[in-house]
Interface confidence: medium
């Protein structure tokens, strides 16, 4: 089960959309690239400077609040899902 | 309350190095990336790059890449912009911000800090 | 580099006038556009995110407009605590960059 963590304040970072182990995987940053896009879709920051936010979740992006939140794995809350909790 | 208090103005000698730091109060600094701007006198603004202070990932722009080192404390929650090779123009004012998430928008800056490069 | 060309880089206005500031961008940044306001030896403020957002406890005379490469922030009616050098920041792509700045002074 999976959990949206309820940010009130901001979190903050590159964060992609999955990350599912148990240990952070952090993917290489940099924002995006590929030159020339043209009719592009609409970005999601996820994907680009919050690649890496959510250390045990998965980055959601709320664009009509223009927000970044992180829906935690299970056992894991807070803003960035970085804390384990004790049950 | 928020702050971000940058360390005070420094002069330095061409070909020298400058770390100025900017400390955070008031918020979870992991939670938030920290950026650097600088501004060289009477002109615009310039961006330099950004952390992530939980891993302390840096990104730069390619024209920093080489001239600035972003590092963050994060027992101090504390930023640090390096830079090396000074010239003169270097000479600028530089600003640390933190970017907010909900909404993401730059909502809180240091005051500045004044480096002045000249032999 | 995403180049952002800001216009004019000066204008004289009274208070009470409206006031228009361009920002074109060599692409489509996707309105991810804010506009800031310095004053001389302070800090940069935000006041406009995602291209037509008001920050919260900014004056709403104060607006954003625009979308694809194109946009604009207008004032209403000049206030006396406007006069100030006003900057664009597209933060579609990294590196992030900053139009010229538009200077707006007293006439």
């Known amino acids: 089960s999976v959990r949206v963590e309820q940010v009130v304040k901001p979190p903050q970072n590159k964060t992609e959309s999955e990350n599912t182990s148990d240990k952070p995987k952090r993917k290489k940053k940099g924002g995006k690239n590929g030159k020339n896009r043209r009719n592009r879709k609409k970005k999601n920051p996820c994907n680009a400077e919050f690649q890496n936010f959510c250390i045990h979740g998965e980055c959601k992006y709320i664009e009509h609040l223009e927000a970044v939140t992180c829906k935690c794995q299970q056992e894991y809350f807070g803003e960035r899902c970085g804390e384990k909790s004790m049950k | 309350e928020v702050q971000l208090v940058q360390s005070g103005a420094e002069v330095k000698k061409p070909g020298a190095s400058v770390k100025i730091s900017c400390k955070v109060s008031?918020?979870?600094?992991?939670?938030?990336?920290m950026y650097w701007v600088r501004q060289a006198p009477g002109k615009g603004l310039e961006w330099i790059g950004y952390?992530?202070?939980?891993?302390?990932?840096?990104g730069y722009s390619q024209k920093f890449k080489g001239k600035a080192t972003l590092t963050v404390d994060k027992s101090t929650s504390t930023a640090y912009m390096e830079l090396s090779s000074l010239r003169s123009e270097d000479t600028a004012v530089y600003y640390c911000?933190?970017?907010?998430?909900?909404?993401?928008?730059?909502?809180?800056w240091g005051q500045g800090t004044l480096v002045t490069v000249s032999s | 580099d995403i180049q952002m060309t800001q216009s004019p880089s000066s204008l004289s206005a009274s208070v009470g006038d409206r006031v228009t500031i361009t920002c074109k961008a060599s692409?489509?940044?996707?309105?991810?556009l804010s506009w800031f306001q310095q004053k001389p030896g302070k800090a940069p403020k935000t006041l406009i995110y995602?291209?037509?957002r008001l920050v919260d406890g900014v004056p709403s005379r104060f607006s954003g407009s625009g979308s694809g490469q194109d946009y604009t922030l207008t004032i209403s009616s000049l206030q006396p605590e406007d006069f100030a050098t006003y900057y664009c920041?597209?933060?579609?792509?990294?590196?992030?960059?900053f139009g010229g700045g538009t200077k707006v002074e007293i006439k």
């Open positions: 911000a933190r970017r907010g998430n909900f909404p993401y928008y730059f909502d809180y």
């Open positions: 952390i992530d202070p939980y891993y302390g990932d840096p």
């Open positions: 995602r291209a037509n």
């Open positions: 008031g918020y979870a600094f992991t939670n938030y990336n």
């Open positions: 920041l597209q933060y579609d792509e990294f590196p992030y960059t």
């Open positions: 692409q489509d940044i996707n309105s991810y």
